[in-house]
């Protein structure tokens, strides 16, 4: 059922990376517009993206209020130019999204190696602590602030002349690894949340190699 020429949204999908969270859906509207509502399981519905012809809605501002909550969204369809019109049951046509818990489900963004410094046969590799849109006391929190020790980084490192990748892990943003003196090494990092069963890993960071500008060398 529903208003003539109005179709319900479908394929509602959460797209979320480092808590930047967008709800996407289909179809592209023909003579209709959409409004999105979002709520926690126990909360009130809040409307966003009013009467839009887009098929996405940025819900980041809502979910960052409490990333450990579980959210539900719904997309209402209205005839273009007649947004007061309702379906046969006296309500606008709408479709519910899957539930979404940002803390458990947001994808981990590609990390970046901030710097590496060699001192003798040790190299300190530092991973950039990316800022998120999650706030506390009016300041934006970093990924480490939000996830704490739940977030680990895996470092892959290898001699420039070799293919075998050694690994190291840290629950901070720094690695201290042993290297052979006089050898150049390359590095790549991956963010991991081991307690998860889905969306556990980020993509790998860009590879950085010794002898390039990010590094420092000290005897």
């Amino acid at each position: 059922s529903g208003t003539t020429n109005t179709v319900a949204a479908y394929n509602l999908t959460w797209k979320s990376t480092n808590f930047k969270t967008i709800l996407e859906w289909e179809p592209k509207p023909v003579n209709q517009v959409y409004t999105v509502q979002i709520s926690t399981k126990s909360g009130d519905w809040k409307s966003k993206c009013f009467y839009t012809t887009d098929t996405e809605c940025d819900l980041t501002d809502e979910i960052v209020k409490d990333v450990k909550q579980t959210y539900l969204a719904r997309v209402f369809s209205y005839p273009a130019g007649n947004v007061e019109s309702t379906g046969s049951a006296g309500e606008p046509l709408y479709e519910n999204s899957p539930e979404f818990t940002p803390y458990l489900e947001t994808n981990l963004g590609q990390p970046t190696i901030q710097s590496f410094e060699q001192v003798g046969t040790k190299v300190n590799v530092t991973v950039e602590d990316e800022r998120t849109l999650v706030r506390r006391n009016n300041t934006f929190l970093s990924l480490r602030d939000v996830f704490g020790k739940d977030l680990i980084y895996t470092l892959y490192y290898w001699k420039s002349s070799s293919s075998g990748k050694k690994t190291a892990k840290t629950n901070t943003n720094e690695f201290l690894i042993d290297v052979d003196k006089g050898e150049n090494y390359c590095f790549s990092v991956q963010a991991v949340i081991p307690s998860r069963t889905v969306n556990r890993k980020s993509t790998d960071s860009p590879v950085e190699c010794m002898g390039q500008e990010k590094g420092e060398f000290r005897e």
Epitope: K169, T170, I177, S188
Partner: antibody, heavy 120, light 107 residues
Framework: EVQLVESGGDLVRPGGSLRLSCAAS????????IHWVRQAPGKGLEWVGY????????YYADSVKGRFTISADTSKNTAYLQMNSLRAEDTAVYYC?????????????WGQGTLVTVSS | DIQMTQSPSSLSASVGDRVTITCRAS??????VAWYQQKPGKAPKLLIY???FLYSGVPSRFSGSRSGTDFTLTISSLQPEDFATYYC?????????FGQGTKVEIK
């Protein structure tokens, strides 16, 4: 339920080749690291190598480097150990094991093992 | 590579005995040490991770401790099902390495 099942073990002549499989169920291998570990008859555990199926990165023990290759097919949720130029000292039960990539990351889950015998 | 030197290689004990097995790492491995139990014809089973944390489902008579680069597995009161071979493993760096194993036999 997390399960790892190895297969492909056989009797093979020195210099021969063999491919072992490690079929995973109950989890997605690309989210984890898969290791191969072997145990010669009456001996201890020896680490062979690992693969991170998400990026294809590998590392091998010196004793097998250049002869063994680990690969993974994420569509089949299976890791492989290709063994070439086999020697008598490669005779062992071969296990695959899952590493959850946590900081503590021990080998939490192991397969039942598959026996490789290299003999003329 | 980091060497894990495990001792003793074998020991004989009776049910109810307190058993201690040690592993010494050739260099610092922080707490990245695990202990496994293996019975004949079976795959190893994880007992202890991060040097002292008991893995889920493992009886509390098993415990692990660390002192610098020395790691200890203790079985407070040996039970009949504990007769097996025990291995330590470091996973602080690649390659991960195992101790030589300790076979716990019935006296």
């Amino acid at each position: 339920e997390v399960q790892l099942v190895e297969s492909g073990g056989d009797l093979v002549r020195p210099g021969g080749s063999l491919r072992l499989s490690c079929a995973a169920s109950g989890f997605t291998i690309s989210y984890y690291i898969i290791h191969w570990v072997r145990q010669a008859p009456g001996k201890g555990l020896e680490w062979v190598g690992y693969i991170d199926p998400s990026n294809g990165y590998t590392y091998y023990a010196d004793s097998v480097k250049g002869r063994f290759t680990i690969s993974a097919d994420t569509s089949k949720n299976t890791a492989y150990l290709q063994m070439n130029s086999l020697r008598a000292e490669d005779t062992a039960v071969y296990y695959c094991a899952r590493d959850d990539q946590s900081v503590s990351s021990p080998f939490e889950y192991w397969g039942q093992g598959t026996l490789v015998t290299v003999s003329s | 590579d980091i060497q894990m030197t495990q001792s003793p290689s074998s020991l004989s004990a009776s049910v109810g005995d307190r058993v201690t097995i040690t592993c010494r790492a050739s260099q610092d491995v922080n707490t990245a040490v695990a202990w496994y139990q293996q019975k004949p014809g079976k795959a190893p089973k994880l007992l202890i991770y991060s040097a002292s944390f008991l893995y889920s489902g493992v009886p509390s008579r098993f415990s692990g401790s660390r002192s610098g680069t020395d790691f200890t597995l203790t079985i407070s009161s040996l039970q009949p099902e504990d007769f097996a071979t025990y291995y330590c493993q470091q996973h602080y760096t690649t390659p991960p390495t195992f101790g030589q194993g300790t076979k716990v036999e019935i006296k």
